[in-house]
Every structure is written in structure tokens, then in C-alpha cells.
């Protein structure tokens, strides 16, 4: 059966989110600088469960800390200024989860590094895309 236009739109939004998150991850992994060590000391909250679009609330709540860590890097590896990058991500997250969502995010007990955090949300996006295909 042909994929509905709303599903296609969701897929494209998830692809865009993936692109932004992978750009950040690449930028961090390419960052041959002592600042990388400091970036890895920052801790991020991870979702207890992330299987549905509403769980993007957990990502949204961590965008400000993410921006702060990226500002620390002051790197050209991110292709865009951190503020613009996070703004892009925020817009997409709001569109995907819906701005009316009143979902209360539950976090895991263990915190994570920025690399683990990004990997978790990239995995989430890829997983949702796969279920929609």
C-alpha cells in the first residue's frame, strides 16, 4: 500500500532531525581538541523509554544543556552555529511530538555523556523511520 502523505511528512521530519543529530555527533567525534575531554564531563538525562513520538519531550527538555555544551566547543565542525542548530532541532521536535503534548518525561537513573545521549536519540529516530517504511 502507498505510504500516506502524513506518514511521508513524519519520515522527512525524522530524517531532518537525524541529520542534525548526526551532524552534532560527527562534529564532536572530529573535534581533535582538549575541549572534547571537557565536553564529555557534562551529563545528560536519558529517557527511561523512547519508542513513540511523544517521548521526544525528553529530548526537548535537554536541548538547552546541549546548546551550552556545543557553545563550549566553539567549533566550525557543526556547520551551523549551536544556537541555530538547536533552534532547527527544537522546531522539528515540536512538529513531531505536537505542541499540545502534556507528556511527562520519565528519565533513567543513570546519566550519559553527550556522545551516548546523541547515539540514543539517533537510534530512536532510525527506529521510528524503520517502522514507518
Amino acid at each position: 500500500a502507498p505510504t500516506s502523505s502524513s506518514t511521508k511528512k513524519t519520515q522527512l521530519q525524522l530524517e531532518h532531525l537525524l541529520l542534525d543529530l548526526q551532524m552534532i555527533l560527527n562534529g564532536i567525534n572530529n573535534y581533535k581538541n582538549p575541549k572534547l575531554t571537557r565536553m564529555l564531563t557534562f551529563k545528560f538525562y536519558m529517557p527511561k523509554k523512547a519508542t513513540e513520538l511523544k517521548h521526544l519531550q525528553c529530548l526537548e527538555e535537554e536541548l538547552k544543556p546541549l546548546e551550552e555544551v556545543l557553545n563550549l566547543a566553539q567549533s566550525k565542525n557543526f556547520h551551523l552555529r549551536p544556537r541555530d542548530l538547536i533552534s532547527n532541532i527544537n522546531v522539528i521536535v515540536l512538529e513531531l511530538k505536537g505542541s499540545e503534548t502534556t507528556f511527562m518525561c520519565e528519565y533513567a537513573d543513570e546519566t550519559a555523556t553527550i556522545v551516548e545521549f546523541l547515539n540514543r536519540w539517533i537510534t530512536f529516530c532510525q527506529s521510528i523511520i524503520s517502522t514507518l517504511t
Epitope: 548526526q22 560527527n26 539517533i122
Partner: nanobody
Framework: QVQLQESGGGLVQTGGSLRLSCTTS????????MGWYRQAPGEQRELVAV???????NYADSVKGRFTISRDNTKDTMYLQMNSLKPEDTAVYYC????????????WGQGTQVTVSS
């Protein structure tokens, strides 16, 4: 090291056509998802078109029916055929290729300028 190189950009009049190419050097597996995004000065980056390893395509509403994405895995090349161009399509166009499994490597080109004059 994998590198992507865009070509085919330029100046065109409203209603005209351009075909962008994205050639990869190094190994880009046919299973990678590839796509095109564009960035206009002062604007948010816009994902224009995507093509999966299996050939499934997806387009932004703003280009649907006018742009066509395709790939030729035998030539390690991806294309974006742009028809009925509008001034609002003016931007730098970047191609990218991303792994769909960990470690989630992402590659993108330097971009090619597309200018549509009215």
C-alpha cells in the same frame, strides 16, 4: 576518507531547470541514506529530498512535483533534477550521505550555489 562533491549549480531564470550531481569518492555503501538539503542566508536549513538505500524517495512540500531525486549506485552518484525553479529556491545546496547503523557516520559536501532570478 569519504568525500562528497556537488556540481551543476548556477544561475537560472524563473521556470528554468538545473540538474545537480553529487559524486562520492571513497566507499559509500548503496545501503546508505542520501539526500539534499539547502541553506539560504538567514534561513533555517531545509531538507529538500531524501532517497533510501532501497530507492524510496521523500520530498519537502515546497519542492514536491518539481524536484526529483535519484541515485546511480554503479556510478557512486546521486542527482537532483530541479524543474520549474522559483526565486525562493535560491540557496546553497548540499548533498549528504549517512549510515543507517552505528557508528552513524555522516558525510556532506561543500555545497553548490543555485540562484534563480526573476
Amino acid at each position: 576518507q569519504v568525500q562528497l562533491q556537488e556540481s551543476g549549480g548556477g544561475l537560472v531564470q524563473t521556470g528554468g531547470s538545473l540538474r545537480l550531481s553529487c559524486t562520492t569518492s571513497g566507499t559509500i555503501f548503496s545501503g546508505y541514506t542520501m539526500g539534499w538539503y539547502r541553506q539560504a542566508p538567514g534561513e533555517q536549513r531545509e531538507l529538500v529530498a531524501v532517497i533510501s538505500g532501497g530507492g524510496d524517495t521523500n520530498y519537502a512540500d515546497s519542492v514536491k512535483g518539481r524536484f526529483t531525486i535519484s541515485r546511480d549506485n554503479t556510478k557512486d552518484t546521486m542527482y537532483l533534477q530541479m524543474n520549474s525553479l522559483k526565486p525562493e529556491d535560491t540557496a546553497v545546496y548540499y548533498c549528504y550521505s549517512r549510515e543507517v547503523t552505528p557508528p552513524w557516520k555522516l558525510y556532506w559536501g561543500q555545497g553548490t550555489q543555485v540562484t534563480v532570478s526573476s
